[in-house]
Interface confidence: low
């Protein structure tokens, strides 16, 4: 299944972002690489990578099936990386499958990418 890529994804709650039409000339936001799809087995560990860059440094949010991903101690976590953000899910369960989306904003622009865990 192909990775879905959108700069104005429907999954971004409209009230979450107030995007200025007057962009600062020095600011930019780029999706460097589409998110990877993952096929794995129960009990294994999966990682999804959101590769973005920008100025000012972007803030990245994770969604699963349109809901904010909430970290679960010792099982589900996300953290900043030099390339953006990494979402890791340990001890995979059938309920972990779905569409995972990262949404990055620098306060003026938004980019997003969606990957599938199945």
């Amino acid at each position: 299944q192909e990775t879905e890529l959108s700069v104005s994804a429907e999954l971004v709650p409209t009230s979450s972002w107030n995007i200025s039409s007057e962009l600062n000339k020095d600011s930019y936001l780029t999706l460097d690489e589409p998110m990877n799809n993952i096929t794995t087995s129960l009990g294994q560990t999966a990682e999804l990578h959101c590769k973005v860059s920008g100025n000012p440094p972007p803030t990245i949010r994770w969604f699963k099936n349109d809901a904010p991903v909430v970290q679960e101690p010792r099982r589900l976590s996300f953290r900043s990386t030099i390339y953006g953000s990494r979402l890791r899910i340990r001890n995979l369960d059938t309920t972990d499958t779905g569409y995972f989306q990262c949404v990055a904003t620098n306060g003026k622009e938004v980019v997003s990418s969606t990957g599938v865990l199945f």
Epitope: L11, P13, T14, S15, S16, T59, R61, N65, D66, A67, P68, V70, Q71, E72, P73, T95, T105, G107
Partner: antibody, heavy 114, light 107 residues
Framework: QVQLVQSGAEVKKPGASVKVSCKAS????????MHWVRQAPGQGLEWMGW????????KFNHKFDGRVTMTRDTSISTAYMELSRLRSDDTAVYYC???????WGQGTLVTVSS | DIQMTQSPSSLSASVGDRVTITCQAS??????LIWFQQKPGKAPKSLIY???SLANGVPSRFSGSGSGTDFTLTISSLQPEDFATYYC?????????FGPGTKVDIK
């Protein structure tokens, strides 16, 4: 436009159950989580849990484990929250709220009194 | 569970005042924080997402700052319609937890 319309006020006796409905319009119910939040009179907000109407998955605040049930009827774009074994301290306004807490229902007052 | 505390619990201010409300988390929540405004008898309304991002339709006099454990909501010039109770919410870990609220009333 997006709207969440909740059922009317309820008065229940201790030990009974209450089921509150939340009808969604203006968006697709099945692709947005629905949170339930309650607020006791004069008190703060308390997250109860969510349901993902697309598949019926739920996540609850452990405080309510075993007492709360969240369901949905996608044919009428409605989510439900049922709270059982009611106590007087369950008297509160119960709200539904969409995925990112961007839209809320008007609230349903549930009064538990003998 | 992550505990959220807010200060002050209440404050009195005048129209035009600069108002600052703080929210503190018992552990690092990154910037997984939402600020809400609630008026009596009404549902909460989201103001700020992800600690610093203004929600659509919210006046620019509202701003959010902070990350980790310490967060601030600032109203740069208080307007009559801003008298209300303000809550923070962390969505870093389950269960999601709200702060106890800060009531802003007229001096």
């Amino acid at each position: 436009q997006v709207q969440l319309v909740q059922s009317g006020a309820e008065v229940k006796k201790p030990g009974a159950s209450v089921k509150v409905s939340c009808k969604a319009s203006g968006y697709t119910l099945t692709t947005n989580y629905m949170h339930w939040v309650r607020q006791a009179p004069g008190q703060g907000l308390e997250w109860m849990g969510w349901i993902y109407p697309g598949n019926g998955n739920t996540k609850f605040n452990h405080k309510f484990d075993g007492r709360v049930t969240m369901t949905r009827d996608t044919s009428i774009s409605t989510a439900y929250m049922e709270l059982s074994r009611l106590r007087s301290d369950d008297t509160a306004v119960y709200y539904c709220a969409r995925s990112d807490f961007d839209y809320w229902g008007q609230g349903t007052l549930v009064t538990v009194s003998s | 569970d992550i505990q959220m505390t807010q200060s002050p619990s209440s404050l009195s201010a005048s129209v035009g005042d600069r108002v600052t409300i703080t929210c503190q988390a018992s552990q690092d929540i990154g910037n997984n924080l939402i600020w809400f405004q609630q008026k009596p008898g009404k549902a909460p309304k989201s103001l700020i997402y992800f600690a610093t991002s203004l929600a659509n339709g919210v006046p620019s006099r509202f701003s959010g700052s902070g990350s980790g454990t310490d967060f601030t909501l600032t109203i740069s010039s208080l307007q009559p319609e801003d008298f209300a109770t303000y809550y923070c919410l962390q969505y870093r870990e389950y269960p999601l937890t709200f702060g106890p609220g800060t009531k802003v009333d007229i001096k």
